[in-house]
């Protein structure tokens, strides 16, 4: 059994935050959409991912992880630039593969410190050790030497596009984990909402049976699907209100009459 | 239906090692969808996580810092079963020791548990 | 290490009567898409722990329709809609969102 080193960050542990902001508590805000969001967390000093509501919330909220640790790491870009350099890599690289405890599928990246390189691996959704990066490009960053890596990958963001539901035609990621995608249309014109309203229901890659509901912009409802419990996308709500109130507000019905609430 | 049953000393000598088995039956030490834990209970420190291995594509194991030079889990693939053994042990040690299961596909939790040990650790 | 705070710690209970118990984490516990890394157990006198319910608002199988979960961030609650008697017993919430797993100091749920 091989013994893992810690996951402690000693370089950064002792610092304070560069504003006062980042000692908030996380705040997903009264709204119930399910925008993937990052904050920094006073009591392990790290950027970590939560849920933001989609309204109110606070300042310690940022859409990348990268935006978050530039903002409340102190010398975090000086640190990224040495280790990327060659000079100093944080011991994390340098922990073995752990696809954690639980057994979703995510795609992630780590570095492999034998062949130099950050490679993909799957993780499972839980635990697992912090050579785990959520994209190859921040990988490269904090573990390679940025003067041999090729241009970052682009990742398909699936919030600027909706599925017409035929059939396969590639894979790419949502929210770092591998499905299968479909034909890319235009959003519709008559929806002015949330764009993740739009995407289907899609019921993940684990084997729960958990009920949940997504809003069909077809028919303007929330509908009940089977969630399996890891992975899927944002158009996933535990209640038919949640879903109604989050999604039902931004179909148009006709250019005279405006939002149906 | 999974079932844990746990078996070793209740009492234990201190500085000395203390030595508990788990038997499976229901599953298998080397499944990929479960993870294989100790857990100790008792009155000052309430449940108290020590530590767990699981198999994917290779072992790994995780320990609790507070025992991480002391502690070793080890499974056996030919009994379908995993042990425990926590050396230099004191009387702060003594406790209600469980093994469990964490299920890893569906449940994400320690959805079994065995019976129970209480180790005393006194000379 | 994440600490979770239970209130109260002792709870005394009518049948047929609610219960609610809360948990709070020291840190907020990462969930995605509503799941959340925050489990419910019970352990009833003389028995080990059981699962009640997993990520937060699932109830494990064979678990009664009267116990739900909910909760965000670092603030969790388990609910008992009409307590039995046979529902007495220390209820422990647990994270798994880092490394070590931890759990809180128990909630002690008996009849009045």
């Known amino acids: 059994l091989s013994e893992e080193a810690d996951d402690t960050d000693s370089e950064l542990g002792s610092m304070k935050p560069l504003h006062t902001f980042c000692a908030m508590k996380a705040d997903d805000g009264p709204c119930k959409a399910m925008i993937r969001s990052y904050f920094f967390n006073m009591y392990t000093h790290q950027c970590e991912e939560f849920i933001y509501g989609g309204c109110e919330g606070n300042e310690n909220r940022f859409d990348t992880l990268e935006e978050c640790k530039k903002t409340c790491i102190p010398g975090y870009e000086k640190t990224a630039v040495k280790a990327a350099s060659g000079a100093e890599r944080p011991d994390f690289c340098f922990l073995e593969e752990d696809p954690g405890l639980c057994r979703g599928y995510m795609k992630r990246y780590l570095y492999n410190n034998q062949t130099k390189q950050c490679e993909r691996f799957v993780y499972g959704g839980c635990l697992g050790n912090r050579n785990n990066f959520e994209t190859l490009d921040e990988c490269k960053k904090i573990c390679e030497n940025p003067v041999h890596s090729p241009s970052p990958v682009n990742e398909v963001q699936m919030s600027d596009y909706v599925t017409d539901g035929n059939t396969v035609t590639d894979r790419s990621t949502v929210n770092n984990i591998v499905v299968p995608q479909s034909p890319k249309v235009p959003r519709r014109r008559d929806y002015r909402g949330r764009p993740w309203c739009l995407q289907p229901a899609d019921s993940g890659l684990c084997k729960a049976s958990e009920r949940r509901f997504y809003y069909n912009s077809a028919t303007g409802k929330c509908h009940r699907f089977n969630y399996t419990g890891c992975g899927g996308n944002n158009n996933n709500f535990t209640t038919r209100r949640r879903c109604l109130r989050s999604c039902k507000t931004g179909l148009i019905k006709n250019k005279s009459k405006g939002v149906v609430k | 239906q999974v079932q844990l049953q746990q078996s070793g000393p209740g009492l234990v000598k201190p500085s000395q090692t203390l030595s508990l088995t788990c038997a499976i039956s229901?599953?298998?030490?080397?499944?990929?969808?479960?993870?294989w834990s100790w857990i100790r209970q008792s009155p000052g420190r309430g449940l108290e996580w020590l530590g767990i291995?699981?198999?994917?594509?290779?072992?790994?194991?995780r320990y609790a810092v507070s025992v991480k030079s002391r502690i070793t889990i080890n499974p056996d693939t030919s009994k379908n079963q995993f042990s425990l053994q926590l050396n230099s042990v004191t009387p702060e040690d003594t406790a209600v020791y469980y093994c469990?299961?964490?299920?890893?596909?569906?449940?994400?939790?320690?959805?079994?548990w065995g019976q129970g040990t209480l180790v005393t650790v006194s000379s | 290490d994440i600490v979770m705070t239970q209130s109260p710690l002792s709870l005394p209970v009518t049948p047929g009567e609610p219960a609610s118990i809360s948990c709070r984490s020291s840190?907020?516990?990462?969930?995605?898409?509503?799941?959340?890394?925050l489990n419910w157990y019970l352990q009833k006198p003389g028995q080990s722990p059981q699962l009640l319910i997993y990520?937060?608002?699932n109830r494990a199988s064979g678990v009664p329709d009267r116990f739900s979960g909910s909760g965000s961030g670092t603030d969790f609650t388990l609910k008992i809609s009409r307590v039995e008697a046979e529902d007495v017993g220390v209820y422990y919430c647990?994270?798994?969102?880092?490394?070590?797993?931890?759990f809180g100091q128990g909630t002690k749920v008996e009849i009045k």
């Open positions: 469990a299961r964490w299920h890893s596909d569906k449940m994400w939790g320690f959805d079994d």
């Open positions: 229901g599953d298998s030490v080397s499944s990929d969808s479960a993870a």
């Open positions: 291995i699981y198999k994917r594509s290779k072992w790994y194991n």
């Open positions: 840190q907020s516990l990462v969930f995605r898409f509503g799941t959340t890394y």
């Open positions: 990520k937060g608002s």
């Open positions: 647990q994270q798994y969102d880092s490394y070590p797993l931890t």
